[in-house]
């Protein structure tokens, strides 16, 4: 098995992940593994020398960087919070704070904004990934209601009066629950029909 450094006349290396082409010497050299950087570049007679990233710095991939990249905190002013700390092999992992969504994306989220309220009679459509986009409000399905303006309130099923031994006084709507009454209670005058004899 050929180990770096080795000559390459066609500008390609055998292991595309762990080697890179050094065009001045026409050789393939080792990249440094995640968590390390190049402390001494390769030559025709000596392979790359790697060193571990210092605290508060990282390199995520096989690389031939001569520095490690500085860890950056999640910016709360931009609505971000930390879900995993920076390590020598991985940058700080951030997400939008609860009740916010990602409004600006450049390889990762850079700016979060407050989720829009959904008006009464609607709820936010459930997303695959929390914080990925703003709310898309959809009407409550039949037999359900939601009576607030809220970014997170869910439509609830209408109360079934009969389950409580009651009778329906007023049907539920998308914005209000069913109104129930005691069977013994008389209907208000405006609701009782006039009987003609």
């Amino acid at each position: 098995q050929v180990v770096p450094p080795y000559g390459s006349e066609n500008q390609t290396c055998r292991d595309q992940e762990k080697e890179y082409y050094e065009p001045r010497h026409r050789i393939c050299c080792s990249r440094c593994p995640p968590g390390t950087y190049v402390s001494a570049k390769c030559s025709r007679s000596r392979d790359t020398v790697c060193a571990t990233c210092a605290e508060n710095s990282y390199n995520e991939h096989w690389n031939y960087l001569t520095i490690c990249q500085l860890c950056r905190p999640c910016d709360p002013v931009m609505g971000l919070e930390e879900i995993a700390p920076c390590t020598s092999k991985r940058k700080t992992q951030c997400r939008c704070q609860p009740g916010m969504f990602c409004a600006a994306w450049a390889l990762e989220c850079t700016h979060c904004e407050l989720l829009s309220d959904c008006p009464p009679g609607t709820e936010a459509e459930l997303k695959d990934e929390v914080g990925k986009g703003n709310n898309h409000c959809v009407p409550c399905k039949a037999g359900h209601f939601q009576n607030t303006s809220s970014p997170s309130a869910r439509c609830q099923p209408h109360t079934r009066c009969e389950d409580q031994g009651l009778v329906e006084a007023a049907p539920g709507t998308a914005q209000s629950d069913t109104t129930c009454r005691n069977p013994s209670e008389s209907l208000p005058p405006e609701m009782s029909g006039t009987m003609l004899m």
Partner: nanobody, 117 residues
């Protein structure tokens, strides 16, 4: 995947100038070294110029003082300004980028430069 598209090649008289461009598109992000190579008719591909991610440039002896490599990181583009062209500069010119901070090496399709009277 990253795509590289070269442009600017053509027929030019000896002593003339051309400017080659190589624009990267697709999932192009990270830290890159950028190169221009050329392949004269019937010969092997050879390195012409280097632009490293650290801002250093380097040239083949045969083009020193005549060719200039530059890059516009905002436009994801690398250029090769070729002055005082000679018949022996006739070749297909290829741009090549190699990602420094992660695996990745990409080639353009090449652009033909012909120097002839």
């Amino acid at each position: 995947e990253v795509q590289l598209v070269e442009s600017g090649g053509g027929l030019v008289q000896p002593g003339g100038s051309l400017r080659l461009s190589c624009a990267a598109s697709g999932r192009f992000f990270g830290i890159y070294d950028m190169y221009w190579y050329r392949q004269p008719p019937g010969k092997q591909r050879e390195l012409v110029a280097i632009s490293t991610s650290g801002g250093h440039t380097n040239y083949a002896d045969s083009v020193k003082g005549r060719f200039t490599i530059s890059r516009d990181n905002a436009k994801n583009t690398v250029y090769l300004q070729m002055n005082s062209l000679r018949p022996e500069d006739t070749a297909v010119y290829y741009c090549n980028i190699q990602r420094v901070d992660a695996p990745g090496m990409y080639w353009g399709q090449g652009t033909l430069v012909t120097v002839s009277s």
